[in-house]
Every structure is written in structure tokens, then in C-alpha cells.
Interface confidence: low
Amino acid sequence: KLTIESTPFNVAEGKEVLLLVHNLPQHLFGYSWYKGERVDGNRQIIGYVIGTQQATPGPAYSGREIIYPNASLLIQNIIQNDTGFYTLHVIKSDLVNEEATGQFRVYPELPKPSISSNNSKPVEDKDAVAFTCEPETQDATYLWWVNNQSLPVSPRLQLSNGNRTLTLFNVTRNDTASYKCETQNPVSARRSDSVILNVLYGPDAPTISPLNTSYRSGENLNLSCHAASNPPAQYSWFVNGTFQQSTQELFIPNITVNNSGSYTCQAHNSDTGLNRTTVTTITVYAEPPKPFITSNNSNPVEDEDAVALTCEPEIQNTTYLWWVNNQSLPVSPRLQLSNDNRTLTLLSVTRNDVGPYECGIQNELSVDHSDPVILNVLYGPDDPTISPSYTYYRPGVNLSLSCHAASNPPAQYSWLIDGNIQQHTQELFISNITEKNSGLYTCQANNSASGHSRTTVKTITVSAELPKPSISSNNSKPVEDKDAVAFTCEPEAQNTTYLWWVNGQSLPVSPRLQLSNGNRTLTLFNVTRNDARAYVCGIQNSVSANRSDPVTLDVLYGPDTPIISPPDSSYLSGANLNLSCHSASNPSPQYSWRINGIPQQHTQVLFIAKITPNNNGTYACFVSNLATGRNNSIVKSITVSASGTSPGLSA
């Protein structure tokens, strides 16, 4: 069947539409288009004859129509008047007529809408606002958006006038939003620019900050007032009902108790004509004096003196607090507080008690701290240390020794060589030394405040020939798989190479062997019994070399699991039983025996003469190494059979 399809069906003004013919018969004479729902010569648009391929305009032809060989009709530059029905009249080859009608609708391209308002400054909870979407357009749908969202459901929102007008009843500050309207028709949709609703509101009850109402005398009072308001509120301050100033902040420096009272902030909105006030009560407390610390001993001597620190001034009904090193007082038997906490006594001061110490006075609002106090504890001198630690020097080098002893006040130093005073300096320097400079070098440290002196003596040897070294050990009896041993080659000498041998061989490569301290120290980690060998150290320089006597490492080990011999377990009655127990151990272990769990003798050998079947049972050997603290044991079963009944062995 012949049909007409309009593409598109809804056409925008100025655009074009194609009336597309479907199921056109094959053999045609011609066809003609008419405006309307029927064939009417007065409303013919165009006719077309196939044979002549001639198109003839009709009375309704506007010059905007184009006819195609397939009978489709294109109408360009569409106007509103083009809306409606179009009829195709087809004359077939057999001159039989056929008709089909199609239609389309024309809509204008919508202009960008705008929003008009009946009230640009509505007052909260009082006014209504009516937004109207302009212009009024026929066949258009009106939509509204608030903050780019569709309208919320609210009894205060009402659409009217075909949704063209949006009314907000009893506006609130929350209605301050971006409003947009949109117009739609089948061919276009346009959205307006946003309109921001400026709702006048407030002032709300003002808030005064900060919230604290208690102050100390001498502080600055700085109160700030804020009230939600549009336009911004104008502020006034009243103290005890008396007007002060018209500012948002009230500042009173260096307040006194007389500034206590009621402080009122008044907020005024000139547009809404409303006033709101908030009152806060401020209390000013008298300022207590700043505390300070007095001491009964400003220069106490370590381990001799006690010090009493007192928090001044004395104030009745006051809480005193103490801090040491910015921490509350530690629990210590050497720290004592008086009943009122005002006096802190340090018994037998040490150099670690220097502080700082602070005391505090607590009042209604806060704690006032004293300035910190530091104790000058006199101590020392401790035993001086002489550096460097070398004891052997070659002739011709410079000898430079430095002495230091912990001391307060700093120690005064003196040097003696072989008991003869040399100089009163912390450092001793002798250039180009010879063998004659060998001797006993003594550093004496003296504390003038405490009157104490301490000395350290060091033997210095000056020799071209290296001395015979010796080996010192930090552990003479290490335990296997537990201890480490550090061998040190003595003496320490300048410009000297240190070497090591084990059982006459150079050191084996082993993760358990480590050289340090310029190869002067050999450390054996996790010693084993195999480390019980002869260790020799050697020293050499450009002119001489020397080796120490060997030192054999005495490794304590064991006891290992003992062995009972002979291995036999079957015996004939009447034989002698002679069991010997042995366990690898250093030192030799202590042995003991148990037969069937009953303790016997503490010997390495167990002897029983002329055994009988009564001697059947379990024989246990127990070994114990008192040096390693370790124990071990083994159990053996012995069977004794009557003579001639068992092929056992006789002892």
C-alpha cells in the first residue's frame, strides 16, 4: 500500500523536511502533490509526468519544494504555515488513481529564556517570590531547576501559569540558590542563565567568641561577635548596659577585676530592621604573683650535699607544683617534698640532678610557672683517661699525650714522669723522643672546688726493637657453642702491623673468625672444642718483628652422650660385671651410676663381683660438667642367666 513518511515529523522553522514515498507502484503515468488531506487543484504544489520528465508547479508551489523521481517531496526553509497534511496523487500506467496522505508539524526554534522576579530582595519568613520564565511561547513546556537539580517536593514551592511561574512562599535563607528555567518544544530546548535569589534574613541571635568567660587580671579581653545576617549585620557592644562601640570586635587591653560584668553584643540588620542581642558574663580573677625558686646551696658537691629548693612566695591555701626536666617529679627515694609541697629536697645530689627545676602556683584558671633553675653540681674528678692508648713508641717520633677527667668545675691537670712533676697542662708533648723517654707517665686531675684529686699511670716504652708481644684474652674458659673469645695482641704500638697464627698456620678463612682494631684483636664467635689450639700473635714494623708465646684456648665443652663399655648386654651367673663409662668433656665430668633407678656410686667404673639373675636390669651412667653446667646420661640393659642356659659372655 502507498504510504507517506515525514522525515522528521517535528520540524524546526528554517530547516527542511522530506516527504518520503513508500511502496510506489512500478508503472506510472505521473504523480502530483497537494497541500491538505485531499486532492484539490487549487492547492496543488507540483505535478510530474514520467514520460516527459516534466515538473509543473501548481497554485500552492512556493519555490521551496523539490520533487524527486521516486515521488518524494523535499520542502526547504520550513515556515510555521507549512504545518499540516500533504497528499500524493499517483496516476498509474493504467490510469488508475491512488492516493496517500502524510503530515508534519512545524515548531519555532525557542529563544534563550530569562527569569523575571516580582521581588529582588525578599525577607525571610515574610515574603513570597514569584519567578516567571520569559518569554511566553506557544506549544512550549516550562521546566525549573534549583542548583541544577529538578524542583524538590515542597509545600512552599508552587508552579502555575502552565508551569511558567514558580512561586516560593515564605522564603527562607536556604532558598538562596541558583534558579534556572527551561523551555522545551519538540524541536528545541533552551535554558536560562541562573538567577541567584538574594534572601534578606537575620540577624540571628549573635554568638560571642571565644566562649571562655574567665580571665586573669592583666590579660587582654578580645571578644568577637557574629550573627548570621544578609546583608551583614551592624554590631554594637554594651558593658553592664552601657554602650561602648559599634564594631564587630571589642578589645580591652590589660583588664582588671573591675572589668568583670555582663557584655552584650547587639546585631542590627538595616534591611530587615531587626535587632538581636546576646549576653555573656565575664569574670576577671586577680593575678597571683609569678613564683620563683630559692636554693639553700647553689654549688652542692656530688654524693655529699643535699639541696633544698623552695617555691616563693608563700601563699596560704595554694597548691604548689614541681617539674624536673619539663616532666612531673619522678618517684625517687632521693627526692622529698615538704607537707605543703613548697620545698623540694634532693638528698645526696649527683651530677645528673642539674635540672632544670620549675615550680608552679595553681589558681582558678591556670598554673603560673617560675623561671627554670639549674643546679651547679660539683663533681669529680673521675679517674682520668690518657689517650692515645699506645704504650710502645719508636725513637724519633713525637709523643703527644692528652688527659681527660669528668669534673665540675673542669679539672686542673699535672703531668709527672717517673714521679717528677713536668707541667700543669692537659696535654703533654715531647718531640723527637729517645729510649731515655721510657718510663711511668702519670696524669693527675685536681678539682679545686671539691679538693679531690685522681691519678692514672701509663707505662711508655721507647725502643727501636719491638718488644715481645703477649696475648690477653677476655675469656679464659669459654663454653662451647655459647661464648665468644676476643684475643688482643699487646702492647698497642704506633705504625705496627699485627699478625696471627693458629697451630703455626696463618688464620683460616671462617665466618666465626673476625679481625678488628687494626688486626690487633682476633675474635672467635661461638667457640667449639676444635678451637682449643695454640694462638700466636706477631708484631712487625720496618725494622723488627717479634712473636708472642703461644696461648692455648681452653674451651669448656660437654659432657657428650656417654658410652658404656664393654658393649655386651648378656652375662652368665657367677661372672664379674665391670662397666666403664666415658664422656667427652672439658673439664672431665663427674660420673654416677643408677641401677633400676637406684643411685649407686660416684665413680667412672662400676664393678659387681659374681653377678646373679638378681642383677638383671637397667644400668644408667650419669655425667655432669660443673663448668659448663650441662648434664648427660645413657641407659644400658643387662641380662644375667643361670650357668649353662645362655650363650652369654663371662667377664
Partner: antibody, heavy 121, light 106 residues
Framework: EVQLLESGGGLVQPGGSLRLSCAAS????????MGWVRRAPGKGLEWVSS????????SYADSVKGRFTISRDNSKNTLYLQMNSLRAEDTAVYYC??????????????WGQGTLVTVSS | DIQMTQSPSSLSASVGDRVTITCRAS??????LNWYQEKPGKAPKLLIY???SLQSGVPSRFSGSGSGTDFTLTISSLQPEDFATYYC????????FGQGTKLEIK
């Protein structure tokens, strides 16, 4: 005589930080609101930030919010502007200025001579 | 934020002329508007605050008017020292400035 003296400006790389100071004298600093205003080369004045007399109330332009911090030390009569994450568009002469305590209309009655901040790599 | 628009952006006039500069706010700011004068190499100077209040020490030939969204700065008789850039500033929050009007010698 009211005097405001800015310091701390200079050349800094993008992303860097700078702290401007403004030493005030000749008026009761502790009771005055203070502010910072800047002028970029070839541009107009731009308000940057303001602070209440007791540091309770601070306000910032959107262009510097989250990067700049205004503060004051009333004991030293000094206003500060800590500028972090600096950008090339922060290049400007920065003025320190005073808001007097006149009811209902904030305005800047005294200005410093300004300090130049240049943000460039 | 409130936007401030000044017009004209530049203006040529002669000594003795009467000059008017306008400033428009994007929303009502009541009478919270200030005017400043800035000369090259110098700090800005306050002329008018609260739309119409003359700052102490400023010559009376400067005057301000307006409220809501439209404001005017008038110089009744231009003097040689008046050639400068003029800025309006709204005193709501934040305290934004207009883009400036450059007053030049004709």
C-alpha cells in the same frame, strides 16, 4: 605617626614558600584589623587577606585560599603572611594595610610602601 | 563572590574639568564601598569610605555617592596632582576591588 613597613619579599621558585612581615608603629596595633593587598605587574589592586585584632577572624581571597596563612603577633606589633605553594601568578607588590575601627564600613586607611615577590624558575 | 565593575577603564581630562567615575556591584552592598587613589611607585591612598564619607586630609573636591549596586566618585575640578589610577572596593566579604580607572591628562 602611623607607619607600616613590609619585608620578606624576594625571588622564589614555583612551589616554594615565603613569609612576609609587616612591622607596625604609631597606633594601637593590638586593637586594629589588618590586611594584605597585592598588585601584579600591569594589573589592578587585589585584596588578599584580612585578620581580626585577636587573630580570631581571618578571611582570604579564593585565589590564595589554602595556600596563604595570615597571622599576627600583637606582642611584637607585627603582621605576617605565610605564602606556600607559590605560583607565577602570585608575582606582585604586596602591601600591608590597616583597617581602622570605624563603625559599619571596613576600609584601609594606612598602607605600607609594599614589598616585591617574584615567583619564577 | 561579589564582582565590582568600574567604568570607564581609562579617561582623558584637563585641569579644571569635572570628572565622574562609576562602579557597579554584582549584588547589593548597601553603602559598603570605598574609593582609593594610586600613583606609580606609591602606596594606594584612601579617598572615600562608606560610599560618601570623605577621609581626613583628602581635598573636598573629591566626593562619593550611591548605594545598593551603583556608586560614583566625582572630582569637581581636576588638579594636576589628581592624574592617577582610581579603584573602588566593596567592603563586604571578601573585600574585592574594581579593575581600576586610569585618569590621564588630555
Amino acid at each position: 605617626e602611623v607607619q607600616l613597613l613590609e619585608s620578606g619579599g624576594g625571588l622564589v621558585q614555583p612551589g616554594g614558600s615565603l613569609r612576609l612581615s609587616c612591622a607596625a608603629s604609631g597606633f594601637t596595633f593590638s586593637s586594629s584589623y589588618m590586611g594584605w593587598v597585592r598588585r601584579a605587574p600591569g594589573k589592578g589592586l587585589e585584596w588578599v587577606s584580612s585578620i581580626g585584632s585577636g587573630s580570631y577572624s581571618t578571611s582570604y581571597a579564593d585565589s590564595v585560599k589554602g595556600r596563604f596563612t595570615i597571622s599576627r603577633d600583637n606582642s611584637k606589633n607585627t603582621l605576617y603572611l605565610q605564602m606556600n605553594s607559590l605560583r607565577a601568578e602570585d608575582t606582585a607588590v604586596y602591601y600591608c594595610a590597616r583597617y581602622p575601627s570605624v563603625p559599619f564600613s571596613p576600609h584601609l586607611d594606612y598602607w605600607g610602601q609594599g614589598t616585591l615577590v617574584t615567583v619564577s624558575s | 563572590d561579589i564582582q565590582m565593575t568600574q567604568s570607564p577603564s581609562s579617561l582623558s581630562a584637563s585641569v579644571g574639568d569635572r570628572v565622574t567615575i562609576t562602579c557597579r556591584a554584582s549584588q547589593s552592598i548597601s553603602s559598603y564601598l570605598n574609593w582609593y587613589q594610586e600613583k606609580p611607585g606609591k602606596a594606594p591612598k584612601l579617598l572615600i569610605y562608606a560610599a560618601s564619607s570623605l577621609q581626613s586630609g583628602v581635598p573636598s573636591r573629591f566626593s562619593g555617592s550611591g548605594s545598593g549596586t551603583d556608586f560614583t566618585l566625582t572630582i569637581s575640578s581636576l588638579q594636576p596632582e589628581d592624574f592617577a589610577t582610581y579603584y573602588c572596593q566593596q567592603a563586604g566579604n571578601p573585600h574585592t576591588f574594581g579593575q581600576g580607572t586610569k585618569l590621564e591628562i588630555k
